[in-house]
Interface confidence: low
């Protein structure tokens, strides 16, 4: 006859491991007992349990309550046992020794592999600001046995670097994601993906990117200077920028206070019917928690009568 077992038995931490050992004998052969022992290299054999055809199962004190026979129905030639609630320390070599009648003794070894699924953690890097250059966006760490794989899933352009720390029975892997912060990254997901044979599916932790920026400010409304003449109604200046966080706007006049009747409405400066007192240098100040920008324009309110008078002078001069 011969023994049937597995070279490797793989189990996830906390699950029950079935250690197989089946004697496939000739007709009329019987199994008297099956002895299980742990036989790691460099250490003496440590008895787990003894299955006796007459006396049943005997578990050694070190494994009391942790070794059982598989549930019935049982084949008298089956010497398999269950190791309950596998822990990392259970990983190693095991041997089953089968005593048969009349064929004698047989033995076989297997390796128990205990997978320790990782519990990943994601740590965001420092606050991201446009113009920083290559910056740490996030790091992701996962420890397990065997070493987990840590990758990144994102539409964002960036570079990754990984390092691994080996412990006695596990390994910790840390991956860092670096990027050049840009405004287009705002709201983009950066997902750490951890793969491991002890996981039914990849574990994913998502971090939403926030990049502070403030665009250059500019002022619209002065495209046609001829529209800025005495008496014109509805004249306005609009300050344009964009930023994250969204910026606030403030209007001032460089050469004095804002004239009476001029109203500030956020990014817009609205004028009453224009007079020459509205001529001056106006400054739009845009700011958010990241930065501030200024844009200034010169308003020159034209007097149509002055212009026509000049034209008359020119005509008379000719």
């Amino acid at each position: 006859g011969e023994l049937e077992t597995s070279d490797v038995v793989t189990v996830v931490l906390g699950q029950d491991a079935k250690l197989p050992c089946f004697y496939r004998g000739d007709s009329g052969e019987q199994v008297g007992q099956v002895a299980w022992a742990r036989v790691d290299a460099g250490e003496g054999a440590q008895e787990l349990a003894l299955l006796h055809s007459k006396y049943g199962l005997h578990v050694s004190p070190a494994y009391e309550g942790r070794v059982e026979q598989p549930p019935p129905p049982r084949n008298p030639l089956d010497g398999s046992v269950l190791l309950r609630n596998a822990v990392q320390a259970d990983e190693g070599e095991y041997e089953c020794r089968v005593s048969t009648f009349p064929a004698g003794s047989f033995q076989a070894r297997l390796r128990l592999r205990v997978l320790v699924p990782p519990l990943p953690s994601l740590n965001p890097g420092p606050a991201l600001e446009e113009g920083q250059g290559l910056t740490l966006a996030a790091s992701c760490t996962a420890e397990g046995s065997p070493a987990p794989s840590v990758t990144w899933d994102t539409e964002v352009k960036g570079t990754t670097s990984s390092r691994s720390f080996k412990h006695s029975r596990s390994a910790a892997v840390t991956s860092e994601f670096h990027l050049v912060p840009s405004r287009s990254m705002n709201g983009q997901p950066l997902t750490c993906v951890v793969s491991h044979p002890g996981l039914l599916q990849d574990q994913r932790i998502t971090h939403i990117l926030h990049v502070s920026f403030l665009a250059e400010a500019s002022v619209r409304g002065l495209e046609d200077q001829n529209l800025w003449h005495i008496g014109r109604e509805g004249a306005m200046l609009k300050c344009l920028s964009e930023g994250q966080p969204p910026p606030s706007y403030n209007w001032t006049r460089l050469d004095g206070p804002l004239p009476s009747g001029v109203r500030v409405d956020g990014d817009t400066l609205g004028f009453p019917p224009l007079t020459t007192e509205h001529s001056g240098i106006y400054v739009c100040h845009v700011s958010n928690e990241f930065s501030s920008r200024d844009s200034q324009v010169t308003v020159d309110v034209l007097d149509p009568q002055e212009d026509s008078g000049k034209q008359v002078d020119l005509v008379s001069a000719s």
Partner: antibody, heavy 122, light 107 residues
Framework: EVQLVESGGGLVQPGGSLRLSCAAS????????MSWVRQAPGKGLEWVSR????????DYADSVKGRFTISRDNSKNTLYLQMNSLRAEDTAVYYC???????????????WGQGTLVTVSS | DIQMTQSPSSLSASVGDRVTITCRAS??????LAWYQQKPGKAPKLLIY???SLQSGVPSRFSGSGSGTDFTLTISSLQPEDFATYYC?????????FGQGTKVEIK
Amino acid sequence: EVQLVESGGGLVQPGGSLRLSCAASGYIFSNYAMSWVRQAPGKGLEWVSRISTGFAGPDYADSVKGRFTISRDNSKNTLYLQMNSLRAEDTAVYYCARQTEDRSYGYDLDYWGQGTLVTVSS
Amino acid sequence: DIQMTQSPSSLSASVGDRVTITCRASQGISSYLAWYQQKPGKAPKLLIYAASSLQSGVPSRFSGSGSGTDFTLTISSLQPEDFATYYCQQHYTTPPTFGQGTKVEIK
């Protein structure tokens, strides 16, 4: 997968109007500036207009300023180009394109739609 | 507006050849230059950004170099699928402008 699909092209008479649409999918539309680029038959590429991510005003090529209006509806993931007072020289394939809006290397166009043909002829 | 001038306007080459296309800007544009490939009836495809950075998914036989006003696109070993028109584009200032294109044809 990033996808841009233009629609709305066709034959229109000089002086007429047309509205092009560009449906975006596969990325966060509101985070990216968008451009329209056109290509006259047998000719090279010409940038038409750009719209930012929401704060700053749009930009236009001098050749279309005052006639074309770019807009976007972030809730519908759609970019538009309203074309008025069309001329024969506006005849072209119009592409919408996503801009890689990154200060580290400016505004190039990393994804393009398949294009829609606009023909202006009497 | 910044003018972009490509040369040559067309070239004939064989599979396996090394092909070089140049692009000159009318004023300095630092590295704000992109290269695109366009096949007949298709949309342009970004090959190179920031003058020398290879866009994800583009074969490594494509490379870009240059800064300031003079730029080069090189195809180290021309493949059958590389026969197309290539455009450079500056995005240093608005409006962004394209070169007139270089058509790479089979010899």
